[in-house]
């Protein structure tokens, strides 16, 4: 039943019926279930095992109606022990000879069958009236997870018999279910830390410790929330949890004061073009507060006066930014600064970077196109465009010529070296219009194309000629 202790002898007189394993004759040698010890087991309760109120098996056959009720004997109802101790408890049952079919005893905890790793032994004590069975269960070095309600089950004549439970209550040092966590806080700003520990035994009382000194003189009941009014420097906090079994100390957590970040380091140029520079950096220490964004500062290095600084803002990650809209073939000084919620870091060391030469900014001028009928070629001439220093060194020209006639369209291009200002290209189609455009090329790239110059290629010897430097679109002069 549900009493905590073994039944009193007075109650035993009223309730007891049938043989008890604890009172088997001394000369009865037990026989063991497979894999069990052959050592004599102690009786369930030092000679005082007691039957439960029987829940008689409800069997239906005529023969089985004559069978006496069978039930597990009563055993101790409640065991309290400390963590890491060993514990043994048992179930016992007396099966009269009239019962033919019995299955092994299984152990259950909180409604789930205990399988595998648990250590249980079943032993059988036969006599002339039947057999007494003792199932011993042992746990070495109990843990909190062994807390629970244990009981036995057995099938007798296809009927499931269940014992009364044995409550196992494991007590130990307080066990933390919530420990304080490291936080980063603003200087002189209040914050909370939480600590929660449980038994059993309850209650669990909490002391807070800051830099090895107790914060609260009187303990607080778990869970405890410590409100720290503010800090000016890093501190280490922990909590002590006390119960009747002793004391457990939580991990120590660092509470850091948020500061401005350290400046970024290792600023590098990953790539340069005529008008952009790709810069990377390694963020400095974040000052215990996530970096929010970074600022790339750019100034022209060649200026004698302290020229204006261009500022480009970007997210803190990735640590990469392409500075655009720069002049070609120019030198720049670049530095990076990053910000967290407290403020901006100092700037990184300045580094020098250069843009490459640009593409030409103007097209070749005074373009003329002649048809040389005898050689069946177009003779193209132009004037070299005015190229600035930052546009780079002229390396050649690209000539685009498009041929159109009824039902035919052909788009071609040629590259010529910078030597001279003329070129010849073979006629591709007769009775067609040819449109010519020319662009200058430097190492920085290709410049804009000139306005188109059109020439009509006759079927025979007639020729329309259209000289043009920079004519209006579609303008055609005949000759």
């Amino acid at each position: 039943g549900g009493t905590a202790e073994k039944w009193e002898e007075t109650e035993l007189d009223q309730l007891f019926s049938g043989p008890l394993p604890g009172r088997l004759p001394v000369n009865h040698r037990p026989f063991s279930a497979p894999h069990s010890s052959r050592d004599q087991l102690p009786p369930p309760q030092t000679g005082r095992s007691h039957p439960a109120h029987t829940a008689a098996p409800q069997v239906t056959s005529t023969a089985s109606k004559l069978l006496p009720p069978v039930a597990f004997n009563h055993t101790i109802g409640h065991i309290v022990l400390s963590e890491h101790k060993n514990v043994k408890f048992n179930c016992s049952i007396n099966i009269p000879n009239t019962y033919q079919e019995t299955a092994g005893i299984s152990w259950w905890k909180d409604g789930k069958e205990l399988l595998g790793a648990h250590h249980s032994i079943t032993q059988f004590y036969p006599d002339e009236e039947g057999v007494s069975i003792i199932a011993l269960f042992s746990i070495a070095s109990v843990q909190r997870s062994d807390n629970g309600s244990y009981f036995c089950k057995m099938k007798v004549n296809n009927r499931e018999i269940v014992s009364d439970p044995i409550y196992v209550e494991v007590q130990g040092l307080p066990y933390f279910i919530k420990q304080p966590e490291s936080v980063n806080v603003t200087r002189n700003t209040a914050f909370n830390l939480t600590c929660q520990a449980v038994g059993p035994p309850e209650p669990v009382n909490i002391f807070w410790v800051q830099n090895s000194s107790r914060v609260n003189e009187k303990p607080e009941r778990s869970p405890s929330v410590l409100t720290v009014p503010g800090l000016t420097e890093t501190a280490v906090f922990s909590c002590e949890a006390h119960n009747d079994k002793g004391l457990t100390v939580s991990k120590g957590v660092h509470i850091n004061i948020k500061v401005i970040p350290s400046p970024p380091t290792e600023v590098h140029i990953l790539n340069s073009t005529a008008h952009s520079i790709l810069v990377s950096w390694v963020p400095g220490f974040d000052g215990y507060s996530p970096l929010q964004n970074c600022s790339i500062q750019v100034k022209e290095a060649d200026r004698l006066s302290n020229g204006s600084v261009m500022v480009f803002n970007t997210s803190a990650s990735p640590h990469l930014y392409e500075i655009q809209q720069l002049q070609a073939l120019a030198n720049y000084s670049i530095a990076v600064s990053c910000r967290n919620e407290i403020g901006w870091s100092a700037v990184s060391p300045w580094i020098l970077a250069s843009t490459t030469e640009g593409a030409p900014s103007v097209a070749p001028l005074n373009i003329t196109v002649f048809l040389n009928e005898s050689n069946n070629i177009l003779d193209i001439r132009w004037t070299k465009p005015p190229i600035k220093r930052q546009d780079g060194e002229l390396v050649g020209y690209r000539i685009s010529h498009v041929w159109e006639s009824a039902g035919t369209y052909k788009e071609l291009s040629e590259e010529v070296s910078q030597n001279g200002s003329w070129a010849q290209i073979p006629v591709q189609i007769h009775n067609a219009t040819c449109t010519v455009r020319i662009a200058a090329i430097t190492k920085g790239g290709i410049g804009p194309f000139s306005e188109p110059v059109n020439i009509i290629i006759p079927e025979h010897s007639k020729v329309d000629y259209a000289p043009s430097s920079t004519p209006a679109p579609g303008n055609t002069d005949s000759m």
Partner: antibody, heavy 118, light 112 residues
Framework: QVQLQQSGPELVKPGASVKISCKAS????????IHWVKQRPGQGLEWIGW????????KYNENFRGKATLTADTSSSTAYMQLSSLTSEDSAVYYC???????????WGQGTSVTVSS | DAVMTQTPLSLPVSLGDQASISCRSS???????????LHWYLQKPGQSPQLLIY???NRFSGVLDRFSGSGSGTDFTLQISRVEAEDLGVYFC?????????FGSGTKLEIK
Amino acid sequence: QVQLQQSGPELVKPGASVKISCKASGYSFTSYYIHWVKQRPGQGLEWIGWIFPGNGNTKYNENFRGKATLTADTSSSTAYMQLSSLTSEDSAVYYCARLGLIYALDYWGQGTSVTVSS
Amino acid sequence: DAVMTQTPLSLPVSLGDQASISCRSSQSLESSNGNTYLHWYLQKPGQSPQLLIYRVSNRFSGVLDRFSGSGSGTDFTLQISRVEAEDLGVYFCLQVTHVPFTFGSGTKLEIK
């Protein structure tokens, strides 16, 4: 979390019977004793008995033997108490409670009021 | 049966005062397994009883440390160090060492 939900109030005539229920949740119903307690208006508490739902075993306070019958339905995790041959003395609030691992009645139902009146 | 005698029946207190309730059993409540199964409950008006102290001196989960229990054998005491308004109600002791389980008659804690 452990909860015991009892059935609603009952108004019954003398000599009749009543069956009140206690639905358990939040733990293994078949593993813990359910106890029943009587409280008459403005009076103390009286222990009626227990049932272990895992095997149906019961134990009664002799004062309630023949008056109360305890049963349990494991499929619905519900314990029942039937009170028979009701008289005005049976008018009371009846509580179910779980006997927890600490061997105390740790969680209680909200109580069921039974009024016996003609 | 183990008869539980609880005193006083009524305990008028001022908020912030200490309160002490006694429970005496007609037989020892120490079980043969070494534990003493004497528990204390509070029943607030219109509510179910709630467990405060189990096995003489262990506070149940969530119970404030104003509540403490002591005693052994047959004599037990519940103490409330600083009474607050939320502590008002009827306090019962309960023994579960012997069948039938028996309750004390109750002590009503009320404001002076």
